[in-house]
């Protein structure tokens, strides 16, 4: 058993049918010695008397808020949560496996640049009685500070007969050095509590591996005289790291016909302009990627040919 926060304790339960459970001793936080009784949640049933209460925790029915009283007065509370292990594996029931980029991916994180700021998000089908707490650091043995805000509900979507809820959190490395080579990964730890169930989830990454630039901005077309060609131009996104001479992007320019089956013409360039043939009813799209490190491409920025 360990303390999650004041008066909230997590009991680690290795569960299997007929498991004996965990013996837990609760101590009433009071100088009183006599006339103390214990109850669980809203029940008035007395579970025991004395300054300590020994319970056998076998299942969620044994978790909850234990209260010690004396003469009708509440002395202290202890909320017991369960962290359940089955077949040697800690439960991961609260969050949904996003399966991207691999199975057992519960947390996904992205950064728009090298400033040390990043966003993580996760999915759940649970709508109520749910709380999250996020901590982060760079490295784990001698951790350097990363400050995370509160997790917030960022999206709701319907998937078949299921409603899915997306939560996200923004974090900022306290002493980020954008140009430095990373040697220690960022660690992100999410505590999730649903009703009386506690679970924890972790992710470990280098900022360079989670970079996804914003799409190029100010995408414009300039027709070339007496030609079907156009000059496409764009700019670096405002959120990208500066100076651009050091934090450089490479770009992919795509001409896509109205039909998805039509052949796509693609041009790759390090410049912020390109000359392409603009077909009728086609659109031109441009996306960006770090020039020197193959992290994610940005989403596309698009304009119609007409």
């Amino acid at each position: 058993i360990w303390e999650l926060k004041k008066d909230v304790y997590v009991v680690e339960l290795d569960w299997y049918p007929d498991a004996p459970g965990e013996m837990v001793v609760l101590t009433c936080d009071t100088p009183e010695e006599d006339g103390i009784t214990w109850t669980l949640d809203q029940s008035s049933e007395v579970l025991g008397s004395g300054k300590t209460l020994t319970i056998q925790v076998k299942e969620f029915g044994d978790a909850g808020q234990y209260t010690c009283h004396k003469g009708g007065e509440v002395l202290s509370h202890s909320l017991l949560l369960l962290h359940k292990k089955e077949d040697g594996i800690w439960s991961t029931d609260i969050l949904k496996d996003q399966k991207e980029p691999k199975n057992k991916t519960f947390l996904r994180c992205e950064a728009k640049n090298y400033s040390g700021r990043f966003t993580c998000w996760w999915l759940t089908t649970i709508s109520t009685d749910l709380t999250f707490s996020v901590k982060s650091s760079r490295g784990s043995s001698d951790p350097q500070g990363v400050t995370c805000g509160a997790a917030t509900l960022s999206a709701e979507r319907v998937r078949g007969d299921n409603k899915e809820y997306e939560y996200s959190v923004e974090c900022q490395e306290d002493s980020a050095c954008p140009a430095a080579e990373e040697s220690l990964p960022i660690e992100v730890m999410v505590d999730a509590v649903h009703k009386l169930k506690y679970e924890n989830y972790t992710s470990s990454f280098f900022i360079r591996d989670i970079i996804k630039p914003d799409p190029p901005k100010n995408l414009q077309l300039k027709p070339l005289k007496n030609s079907r060609q156009v000059e496409v131009s764009w700019e670096y996104p405002d959120t990208w790291s500066t100076p651009h001479s050091y934090f450089s992007l490479t770009f992919c320019v795509q001409v896509q016909g109205k039909s998805k089956r039509e052949k796509k013409d693609r041009v790759f360039t390090d410049k912020t302009s390109a000359t392409v043939i603009c077909r009728k009813n086609a659109s031109i799209s441009v996306r960006a990627q770090d020039r020197y490190y193959s992290s994610s491409w940005s989403e596309w920025a698009s304009v119609p040919c007409s």
Epitope: F60, T125, K163
Partner: nanobody, 123 residues
Framework: EVQLVESGGGVVQAGESLRLSCAAS????????MGWFRQAPGTEREFVAT????????YYADSVKGRFTISRDNAENTVYLQMSSLKPEDTAVYYC????????????????WGQGTQVTVSS
């Protein structure tokens, strides 16, 4: 929301068997741990059995262990309670419940409930 409808109750002789079914509709059935409870007249609702969302783990009240079997079919959105060697003291209204905490024998840990099906065991 999850809607639960129990069926399969009836009157049987002591020692006989009965199979209860609980059909779920609404939100995705496979997200939920499922349980069976029962209530005899003048008594509190009593835990019978529960099964986790995968169908890989089960948990039973001592009073039914070895006689009752809970199972589920996530493709059919149905949970079953196979009851054998029935005794007169098994007479009760049987309720199906859906929740998110497994295992739990406490009724308030379940979020959705059916209307119940009557089982009567005569001696």
């Amino acid at each position: 929301e999850v809607q639960l409808v129990e069926s399969g109750g009836g009157v049987v002789q002591a020692g006989e068997s009965l199979r209860l079914s609980c059909a779920a509709s609404g939100r995705s059935f496979s997200n939920f741990e499922m349980g069976w409870f029962r209530q005899a007249p003048g008594t509190e609702r009593e835990f019978v059995a529960t099964i986790n969302w995968r169908g890989s783990s089960t948990y039973y009240a001592d009073s039914v262990k070895g006689r009752f079997t809970i199972s589920r079919d996530n493709a059919e959105n149905t949970v079953y309670l196979q009851m054998s060697s029935l005794k007169p003291e098994d007479t009760a209204v049987y309720y199906c419940a859906a929740g998110r905490l497994f295992p739990s024998s406490r009724s308030r840990d379940y979020d959705y409930w059916g209307q119940g099906t009557q089982v009567t065991v005569s001696s």
